[in-house]
Structure formats: structure tokens, C-alpha cells
Interface confidence: medium
């Protein structure tokens, strides 16, 4: 229904707290360099204006679109050109071009320092003094570093943060209560960020149809008892929600997501028997819970997929009559039977099925032609299954850090032109797949591994797009989203690469490394490993292991030495010489 004032409508629907949080996220995601105080001031102005519109929808400017209102606010910021360069040119445009322009200037890798967590005592003090400001800082800091973070989900993580602080700040040992809990939230939030970025990439590069196909597959796996019309209803609504969030329409997105959660809870009978626990929760928790609800039990009497899609005499007629619906029902029927497959794999199978029908339905004897299509799925299914087995075996043998190093070597060989920080970040993230997925039951491993890897590789592609340096990466990132992971897996050593010359300073370390937290130490060592591979792309695993073991021993020795600086300055050059010899 049309509302006289869009901003009043959203304020009323969302309530003041969520309204303010979402406006803060929106501004922080658009203008990523502004301070919290600058954004908080704008948020208060927008909220005050919204309240005047709630009181009188006919008041001046209340009928303006949200993009116009928000864009005007952003464009009124002083020193916009000095701080944001050509983003200021967006302000010369009219809506909707102005909003599109803002979206194009979102930076996936802003040059902001890592978000450092204050020590427990200080955190608790500032939280107790002003919880609202404290949570505002959290929303601002996360949103500006993750400009496509799913806004209603970020409100959920802020709520989790709040609950953890409320609980732990009342404890005697605040640190040991806070650290593991906040680490858990941080890990989940980072995964949520890369997953959502993948959804926005799908929407931006391939349009709504591609996202809707993803949603149909995913929802069919989770709700195998819902009928096709129900699944497409949910997929259509979910597509709208994600389109809005990816497009910066955060108030609409959060409002529609709440509506979708309400619809699901009111229609459990036709969707799934597993929703009740989620539906008993308050809004943010309910929507989060529904997004990761366990799969419903599959119907016992499902006929073989071949009956309708291979053996039926009217396959080509059904396909010709309504291609999208017929392919949609195929994707639905296949997905509901295979909760053990990744969405990426299901979409590859649907693509293969479509290509087969396109070819065969034009031939003299279509059934003879498409009769073997299910057998042709076999290699497509085996490839990711083998990937999971090989990588989980390796993870179990090496542990997370060792597994990350193996991936780092592999990916540096595939794309040695990529910057070392990007390679290290990618390898560390890809390596976490082991901890995240390899410990799961067998039937959950494949969807966990492949869909997570796809999301991480999407980030690699986004970073590479900014400064394209590797033809290998460009090739894999240019294709369809579902083919990316197999493409990267199939890459071998880049034979066109001219090895980097050996620079001693790259492998020179100082005693300050000793006091770094374990994670930072690992990153330093992994940076050195990537540089070694860039110097010797064809070094054997054995050679690299020798060098890295020597390096670890050197760090251990010098960090335990009484005079660390002397140890580093005398033993360091010896290490560099040994490394050169080992790789010669």
C-alpha cells in the first residue's frame, strides 16, 4: 500500500531503536571514513525529522523518498570532496542515479585500521556509562568496514554483543567471560559478512533471477515438505529483502524481513515442522533463527527424480510451455532430495539439465538424447565430493594453521601476482573451512565446505577487480558465480610468472615480533611463506617445510634469548642464507 510519508511509515513499523540503528548503518556503509560522532549527529537529525512526519505526514518534505532524504543529508556533509574525492560527484546527480553512484563507491577494502577490542575493564566502563553510544560505535565500526553487511542481521549481532556485555561485566573475571563469547560473535559476524557480500554480488552481476534460483535451491533443501508454489513465494520475498539491503534500502529491507518472518511463523503448517522454536523468539532472534533453521524431515514417499524429468513423455512439451517454471520445479525437486549437496552444486546440475534440454528438445529423438542426463551429473557431483575428502583429510593431518599454510602455497602458485596481504587473508579464511566444516557429520560437510569457499573466493574476486593483476584470477572471476570454485580448484602453477628476486629485507625480522599476539605472529610467518613461493614458485613442499621449520626454530630461539635484539641481528642473516641455500 502507498503511504503519504515513507519515512513515517518505516519509523512506525520499525520503532525508534531499530530505525536509528539502521540509519546509522546506512550512513556508515555509504560514507566509510566519517567518524562516529559525525554520523550520530546525522542520525539524530533524520530521527527528529521522522518524528515530525509521524506527527503530521503532510509536513514539509515528509513525502520525499528515503533515497532523496538520506542522499540530501550525505551531500550536505562539509568537506565531502576533500575526504571522499570523486564520490562528491554523486551529489551532482538526481535520484535514482545519485544512490546508484553512492553504491558504486562503496569500498570492500577500506583503508581503516583493524577494529581493536578494548580491554575488558575499559569496555565495561564505557558500556555501563552509555550502552546506547557503546552499541552505536559497534554498529558504526562494523558497518564502515563491511559496507554490504546485512543490516537487520547486524542489529542482531549488536543485540548479542549487548547481552554478552550485560552478563560479563557483572562477573569478577570480566576478561575470561568476555573473550571467548565475543570471539564467537566476531567469527559468526565475519562469516555472515562474506556470505551476504556473495548474495549482493549475485544480485549485482547476474540479477534477481540468479539470486532467486539460489534461494529456491536453499529453501527447498530446508523445507522439503513445502510445495513448489510455497517455495517460490518464500524465494520471491527473500529476493526482495536482499535486493533492498544490497541496494542500500535498509529500512525497507529490515521491515520486509520482519514481514517475511511473520509470514513464515503464521504459515508453519505449509512450510516446515521445525519453525516453532524460532517463532517463539523476539524479532531479531526470530529472523536470525529462521535463516539458519535445521532442515525439515524429507517426505518418505518422494518418487525418483527421473519420473518427471527424464522418463515422462512430455518433458520437452513441459519445458517449452514454461521454461522458467519447469526448470524451477526441477531445481526444487532435486534440491529437496539433496540437503547433502551445496547450493552451488545444485545450481550447476540445474544448468546442466537446462543445457541438455535445449540441445535435445531440438533433435529428432529427444528422449534418447536426454535419457542419460542424470548419469552425466555424476562427474559434477564427484568433483566437490573429492575436494571435501582431500581437504578435510589434509586439515585433520595438519590442523588449522598448517592447513592454511598448505592453501597459501597452493594459491600463491596459482596466482603469484596477487598482493601478499590479499593471498594471506584469503588463505587464512579458506583454511578456516576445516575448523568450520570438517568436524560436521558427513552429510553436512559438502554444503558447508563449498558454499563457504564460494563466499571467500567472491571476496578474492572483489579485491582483485580493484587492481587486476592475474589472468588466472580474472578468468575464474569472470565466469558465473557457481563455476568460480571449480575454476579456482582447477588452476595449476602459473607458468607465465617471472619469479620475484630474493630480497633479504623481506625475510628480516626484529624482536618486536616476539610480543605480538599469536594471530599476528602467524600472519608474519605466512607473509614470509607467500614471499618464498613468489621467489620460488616451483619449490617442493619438502623444501618449503624445511625453510618454515628453520624459521619457526629461529623465532623460538631468539624470542627466548636474554638479548633478543642481538640474536635477531646476528641469527637473522644466517637464516636468510640458509633459506637461499635450501631453495637453490
Amino acid at each position: 500500500e502507498a503511504h503519504k510519508s515513507e519515512i513515517a511509515h518505516r519509523y512506525n513499523d520499525l520503532g525508534e531503536q531499530h530505525f536509528k540503528g539502521l540509519v546509522l548503518i546506512a550512513f556508515s556503509q555509504y560514507l566509510q571514513k566519517c567518524s562516529y560522532d559525525e554520523h550520530a549527529k546525522l542520525v539524530q537529525e533524520v530521527t527528529d525529522f521522522a518524528k515530525t512526519c509521524v506527527a503530521d505526514e503532510s509536513a514539509a518534505n515528509c513525502d520525499k523518498s528515503l533515497h532523496t532524504l538520506f542522499g540530501d543529508k550525505l551531500c550536505a556533509i562539509p568537506n565531502l570532496r576533500e575526504n571522499y574525492g570523486e564520490l562528491a560527484d554523486c551529489c551532482t546527480k538526481q535520484e535514482p542515479e545519485r544512490n546508484e553512484c553512492f553504491l558504486q563507491h562503496k569500498d570492500d577494502n577500506p583503508s581503516l585500521p583493524p577494529f581493536e577490542r578494548p580491554e575488558a575493564e575499559a569496555m565495561c566502563t564505557s558500556f555501563k556509562e552509555n550502552p546506547t553510544t557503546f552499541m552505536g560505535h559497534y554498529l558504526h565500526e562494523v558497518a564502515r568496514r563491511h559496507p554490504y553487511f546485512y543490516a537487520p542481521e547486524l542489529l542482531y549481532y549488536a543485540e548479542q554483543y549487548n547481552e554478552i556485555l550485560t552478563q560479563c561485566c557483572a562477573e569478577a573475571d570480566k576478561e575470561s567471560c568476555l573473550t571467548p563469547k565475543l570471539d564467537g560473535v566476531k567469527e559468526k559476524a565475519l562469516v555472515s559478512s562474506v556470505r551476504q557480500r556473495m548474495k549482493c554480488s549475485s544480485m549485482q552481476k547476474f540479477g534477481e533471477r540468479a539470486f532467486k534460483a539460489w534461494a529456491v535451491a536453499r529453501l527447498s533443501q530446508t523445507f522439503p515438505n513445502a510445495d513448489f508454489a510455497e517455495i517460490t513465494k518464500l524465494a520471491t520475498d527473500l529476493t526482495k529483502v536482499n535486493k533492498e539491503c544490497c541496494h542500500g534500502d535498509l529500512l525497507e529491507c529490515a521491515d520486509d524481513r520482519a514481514e517475511l518472518a511473520k509470514y513464515m511463523c503464521e504459515n508453519q503448517a505449509t512450510i516446515s515442522s521445525k519453525l516453532q522454536t524460532c517463532c517463539d523468539k523476539p524479532l531479531l532472534k526470530k529472523a536470525h533463527c529462521l535463516s539458519e533453521v535445521e532442515h525439515d524431515t524429507m517426505p518418505a514417499d518422494l518418487p525418483a527424480i527421473a519420473a518427471d524429468f527424464v522418463e515422462d513423455q512430455e518433458v520437452c512439451k513441459n519445458y517449452a510451455e514454461a521454461k522458467d517454471v519447469f526448470l524451477g520445479t526441477f531445481l526444487y525437486e532435486y534440491s529437496r532430495r539433496h540437503p547433502d549437496y551445496s547450493v552451488s552444486l545444485l545450481l550447476r546440475l540445474a544448468k546442466k539439465y537446462e543445457a541438455t534440454l535445449e540441445k535435445c528438445c531440438a533433435e529428432a529423438n529427444p528422449p534418447a538424447c536426454y535419457g542419460t542426463v542424470l548419469a552425466e551429473f555424476q562427474p559434477l557431483v564427484e568433483e566437490p565430493k573429492n575436494l571435501v575428502k582431500t581437504n578435510c583429510d589434509l586439515y585433520e593431518k595438519l590442523g588449522e594453521y598448517g592447513f592454511q599454510n598448505a592453501i597459501l602455497v597452493r594459491y600463491t602458485q596459482k596466482a603469484p601476482q596477487v598482493s601478499t596481504p590479499t593471498l594471506v587473508e584469503a588463505a587464512r579464511n579458506l583454511g578456516r573451512v576445516g575448523t568450520k566444516c570438517c568436524t560436521l557429520p558427513e552429510d553436512q560437510r559438502l554444503p558447508c565446505v563449498e558454499d563457504y569457499l564460494s563466499a571467500i573466493l567472491n571476496r578474492v574476486c572483489l579485491l582483485h577487480e580493484k587492481t587486476p593483476v592475474s589472468e588466472h584470477v580474472t578468468k575464474c572471476c569472470s565466469g558465473s558465480l557457481v563455476e568460480r570454485r571449480p575454476c579456482f580448484s582447477a588452476l595449476t602453477v602459473d607458468e607465465t610468472y617471472v619469479p620475484k628476486e630474493f630480497k633479504a629485507e623481506t625475510f628480516t625480522f626484529h624482536s618486536d615480533i616476539c610480543t605480538l599476539p599469536e594471530k599476528e605472529k602467524q600472519i608474519k610467518k605466512q607473509t614470509a611463506l607467500a614471499e618464498l613461493v613468489k621467489h620460488k614458485p616451483k619449490a617442493t613442499a619438502e623444501q618449503l617445510k624445511t625453510v618454515m621449520d628453520d624459521f619457526a626454530q629461529f623465532l623460538d630461539t631468539c624470542c627466548k634469548a636474554a638479548d633478543k635484539d642481538t640474536c635477531f641481528s646476528t641469527e637473522g642473516p644466517n637464516l636468510v642464507t640458509r633459506c637461499k641455500d635450501a631453495l637453490a
Partner: nanobody
Amino acid sequence: EVQLLESGGGLVQPGGSLRLSCAASGFTFDTSSMLWVRQAPGKGLEWVSVIHQSGTPTYYADSVKGRFTISRDNSKNTLYLQMNSLRAEDTAVYYCAKFPSRKMKFDYRGQGTLVTVSS
């Protein structure tokens, strides 16, 4: 027991319009997706359009897209099909049906109403 009763068919000239209705009883209409199917003389059944229980989304066979509109009134347990720009090839018996899980197959349908498009 499920009952579906179609009405509104008749003879119409090419380019003309008709509105079909289907009164449903014996099941919870507002939790059931519904569809219209048709059977032309001497041909097999062909699905025409599907509507979700809530009224959106809707789906159409390519042959009727842009000309036919499916809708429903859950308070009256009634399904509708508005047919515009009718063509001779739309001549068929039109059935409303309850939409189940499997593909575009359907379990319950009514007796049908005949639509004849002829000059």
C-alpha cells in the same frame, strides 16, 4: 470431501474477454495453492496458471502470459481467471485444481467449464 465448481465459460469472439470463477469447498482454501488447467479438443491437459495461497506470486504458461490474470478471494473461497485478448487456440475446457507438491501435476480438479473462441 474436496469440491471445485467452475463457471463463467461460453462462446466469445477472438479478441474478446471472459472471467472464469471456481468455488472451492471441503478443504482449507486459504492454505492451498491453486491452478487453472485446460484441455483443448483432442489434446492433453495443459497447465495455464498457478497462484500461491496468499495471492502472490503467480505463474503463467508462456502461451497466456500478458493476456490472462489469475486471482483469488480467500474470504469467499473463490479462484478467478480473467482472460483477455482471447484467441481461437484458447478454446478448451478449463478446470480449476488444487495444487500439490509434485511438479505441475495436480490431485483434485472440478468438472470444468467450456470456453469457445470463434467468430
